[in-house]
Interface confidence: low
Amino acid sequence: IPVIEPSVPELVVKPGATVTLRCVGNGSVEWDGPPSPHWTLYSDGSSSILSTNNATFQNTGTYRCTEPGDPLGGSAAIHLYVKDPARPWNVLAQEVVVFEDQDALLPCLLTDPVLEAGVSLVRVRGRPLMRHTNYSFSPWHGFTIHRAKFIQSQDYQCSALMGGRKVMSISIRLKVQKVIPGPPALTLVPAELVRIRGEAAQIVCSASSVDVNFDVFLQHNNTKLAIPQQSDFHNNRYQKVLTLNLDQVDFQHAGNYSCVASNVQGKHSTSMFFRVVESAYLNLSSEQNLIQEVTVGEGLNLKVMVEAYPGLQGFNWTYLGPFSDHQPEPKLANATTKDTYRHTFTLSLPRLKPSEAGRYSFLARNPGGWRALTFELTLRYPPEVSVIWTFINGSGTLLCAASGYPQPNVTWLQCSGHTDRCDEAQVLQVWDDPYPEVLSQEPFHKVTVQSLLTVETLEHNQTYECRAHNSVGSGSWAFIPISAGAHTHPPDE
């Protein structure tokens, strides 16, 4: 580490004095200090002498000696005060530029350490500092404004109390620049626009940045539009707004609009699409099949997508029958918006009851007229089965009626013993009826089929079972003859 002679941290001299500063190191050494007149430099290998025989207040400052060849980069310093009764301040720079939130050093160096107790920082023309200005003072370096703000970009003077009066330094201009994080922030509204030919439209492109130096423009397809710009300063940001007002839109106004803003950091752009239509429109669609089948007791959500301009003036879900005259509860209907012109309407039908099968229609209205979309809801039921013994054309017949939806299939089983349900071990015979007679088949109702099994003689100690099944489930009815002869004759006419 180099060594400075005189070996004191500070040296105080009067104007006109001779000052000699000598630095000695292991290798060659160099001096660094404030730019000031009248210094003479003598270098001799490992030593360097800085001297003046006419010190002035401008020589006030810190002089540092370094050894360029030293890998540890050691240095030594001495601070020189040239205490001029007429000049308490040596200002090293008249303009200081920093970014916001950095510390700003205003380099007014005190020429006499004795004056430190009476120093202060003021704005020019004796104005006080702005509120919340946080600063500190060092006689070697000057005043530091901590975490400088853009609003503190002002002209400052350093003040010292000499003989009861305040003596000012020349002014120092502080420029606090905003840190520009990136290209300007952009908004383009609306994000999508639809208008009928002849209507008015407005597209607003706005950009904002912490710095005033940025450009913004609006382009239609690839044409840059000439629009007057409104400027504002709000919430510590500069805003530039371009508003395109179209009194009567036509088809040539349609297309892609891009809002583009740029600054030194780069460019941002955002786009929207403007559609011009001949007349109002209202389109209803569904991603679901309009014919729905649901098992009784389960729930279903019916969804309708609406594309409309102008906006809807009314909409509702309606039950068209054929059962009760109930209407869907409004609380089961919900509306959500994808964007300005597209909406989804949902009707929730929880725990469906038999009387809720039928047609559900969604109706919507806008200036383009009414539109409706109708769903047909059929409920699925597991089969219900019953068996009776009768005579048909003189023959003993088991008659099985099965009711359900979808249409049930019918299978007859004959098994040994008396049982509620035939199991595999007991089965003696199986008959499938591929074409049972359909007794009733109305829309939204159960399908009822009938199957006949002709039995000449009912076997005692046997069970005849009719089984019906469909995609929902199965049902069965076991017929147990009470006695072999009890049902061998036709009933009385």
Partner: antibody, heavy 124, light 109 residues
Framework: QVQLVESGGGLVRPGGSLRLSCAAS????????MSWVRQAPGKGLEWVSA????????NYADSVKGRFTISRDNAKNSLYLQMNSLRAEDTALYYC?????????????????WGQGTLVTVSS | QAGLTQPPSVSVAPGQTARITCGGN??????VHWYQQKPGQAPVLVVY???DRPSGIPERFSGSNSGNTATLTISRVEAGDEADYYC???????????FGGGTQLTVLQ
């Protein structure tokens, strides 16, 4: 500071007319739909009427439909409510409010900035 | 155009949590907004879109909405929170703004 200032209220006989005005400052007036809301003495808030940003669409509460007319002049940053055939039950403090219309996730509207109100008294 | 039901009054001690409800048929499918009105003053928006807060409104104010009830919650209640509170929705089918009847919040001293 965004500001809405209502004026035009006063004492009027039943069947009479009044025209309320609302002057807007410090915000982009024509970005917003606007509404009138009233509050009868000691009662709750009642929405009266709304108008879209460009005046192209208007809407009224059933209680005032056919008697009141809402309008705006964007060049003057002003909102108006023409009240005809006034009744005793129209006595209230009338507020104007900037109305934010949102079509995002859900459709909704809310009243963002309110004026201090102007008092309308209908009495014989 | 269904109405919104609010309790006429709610009382709470300072530092406690106040909950003001707003009932309505399937209100959870709509967006609910809340206003505070102090005596002699205009209403002020305190919560919009169920749970969003405008700038300048303390974090103590929060909202929720599901099913048939929306709730405005004021935590760590202060004397200055004493006011009338109104809920509001937009009825999409009529395009009308609908207010609840209002709730008077009293801060017990």
């Amino acid at each position: 500071q965004v500001q809405l200032v209502e004026s035009g209220g006063g004492l009027v006989r039943p069947g009479g007319s009044l025209r309320l005005s609302c002057a807007a400052s410090e915000f982009t007036f024509d970005d917003y739909a606007m509404s009138w809301v009233r509050q009868a003495p000691g009662k709750g808030l009642e929405w009266v009427s709304a108008i879209s940003w460009n005046g192209g669409s208007t809407n009224y509460a059933d209680s005032v439909k056919g008697r009141f007319t809402i309008s705006r002049d964007n060049a003057k940053n002003s909102l108006y409510l023409q009240m005809n055939s006034l009744r005793a039950e129209d006595t209230a403090l009338y507020y104007c409010a900037s109305t934010v219309e949102v079509a995002h996730r859900r459709l909704y509207k809310y009243l963002e900035v309110w004026g201090q109100g102007t008092l309308v008294t209908v009495s014989s | 155009q269904a109405g919104l039901t609010q309790p006429p009054s709610v009382s709470v001690a300072p530092g406690q949590t106040a909950r003001i409800t707003c009932g309505g048929n399937n209100i959870g499918s709509k967006s609910v907004h809340w206003y505070q009105q102090k005596p002699g003053q205009a209403p002020v928006l305190v919560v919009y879109g169920d749970s969003d807060r405008p700038s300048g409104i303390p974090e103590r104010f929060s909202g929720s909405n599901s099913g048939n009830t929306a709730t405005l919650t004021i935590s760590r209640v202060e004397a200055g929170d004493e006011a009338d509170y109104y809920c509001q929705v937009w009825d999409i089918s009529s395009d009308h703004v609908v207010f609840g009847g209002g709730t008077q919040l009293t801060v017990l001293q």
